[in-house]
């Protein structure tokens, strides 16, 4: 998979969206690689 | 409100050395990769390099590499582009941006900066 | 380094026309792909990411498509403050490339 900081971000972003946001507050992109996903 | 706010226009002469600042509001500046982009007269964006704020990481254009340094100072919220040796073909508007997911989700641009290489 | 190419380079289209822009990638980047516009003296406008995805407050006019190596930007029914210069990004692969952009004219 895509593991450029802008494919992190994105995919957090989505991971995020299906959550509802109930995600621990230090998952943000600059704390997570691709292999969080 | 997601700002990034950049520092003013340049003139430098071939050779010498320029610090661009971009200057985040609105968010956790931590959070979220910086981009540094450039733009020459009528030419295609160019992509210089990201920072992660957060632990001051960084990926390069092989282009730049050597010659670009990005930092971070994490107290003020604010980014730094440094640009070495400069040429006449590095006359260009350079940008910061980011992409943040709160509080809105978009991929936030600076205003520009102008930085013109003449001697 | 992963070459963008953007066709065409410019278009003269009128208002209410439906216009097409296409991004081609010299090699595969999945949907890894955005959009941006910009106006003479702006910044760039972020339209698209993930190749067909609208960023909040985009117009629905906006619509892109594509995945591997062909990718496209479709305006449904140009409005006047579509005229501008449109540019695809690659973000799969660093350095992350931009194509050359096309200017959509007046016709």
């Known amino acids: 998979a895509c593991d450029t900081a802008t494919c992190v971000t994105h995919r957090l972003a989505g991971l995020l969206s299906r959550s509802g946001g109930v995600v621990k507050n230090n998952f943000v992109p600059t704390n997570v690689g691709s292999k969080a996903f | 409100e997601v700002q990034l706010v950049q520092s003013g226009a340049e003139v430098k002469k071939p050779g010498a050395s320029v610090k661009v600042s971009c200057k985040a509001s609105?968010?956790?500046?931590?959070?979220?990769?910086m981009n540094w982009v450039r733009q020459a007269p009528g030419q295609r964006l160019e992509w210089i390099g990201d920072?992660?704020?957060?632990?001051?990481?960084?990926n390069y254009n092989q282009k730049f590499k050597g010659r670009a340094t990005l930092t971070v100072d994490k107290s003020a919220s604010t980014a730094y582009m440094e640009l070495s040796s400069l040429r006449s073909e590095d006359t260009a508007v350079y940008y910061c941006?980011?992409?943040?997911?709160?509080?809105?989700?978009?991929?936030?641009w600076g205003q520009g900066t102008t930085v013109t290489v003449s001697s | 380094d992963i070459q963008m190419t953007q066709s065409p380079s410019s278009l003269s289209a009128s208002v209410g026309d439906r216009v097409t822009i296409t991004c081609k990638a010299s090699?595969?980047?999945?949907?890894?792909v955005a959009w941006f516009q910009q106006k003479p003296g702006k910044s760039p406008k972020a339209l698209i990411y993930?190749?067909?995805y609208r960023y909040s407050g985009v117009p629905s006019r906006f619509s892109g498509s594509g995945s591997g190596t062909d990718f496209t930007l479709t305006i449904s029914s140009l409005q006047p403050e579509d005229f501008a210069t449109y540019y695809c990004?690659?973000?799969?692969?660093?350095?992350?490339?931009f194509g050359g952009g096309t200017k959509v004219e007046i016709k």
């Open positions: 990004q690659q973000y799969n692969n660093y350095p992350y490339t």
């Open positions: 090699q595969n980047v999945d949907t890894n």
């Open positions: 941006a980011s992409i943040i997911i709160v509080p809105n989700y978009f991929d936030y």
């Open positions: 920072i992660n704020p957060n632990n001051v990481g960084t």
């Open positions: 609105g968010y956790t500046f931590t959070d979220y990769y």
């Open positions: 993930s190749a067909s």
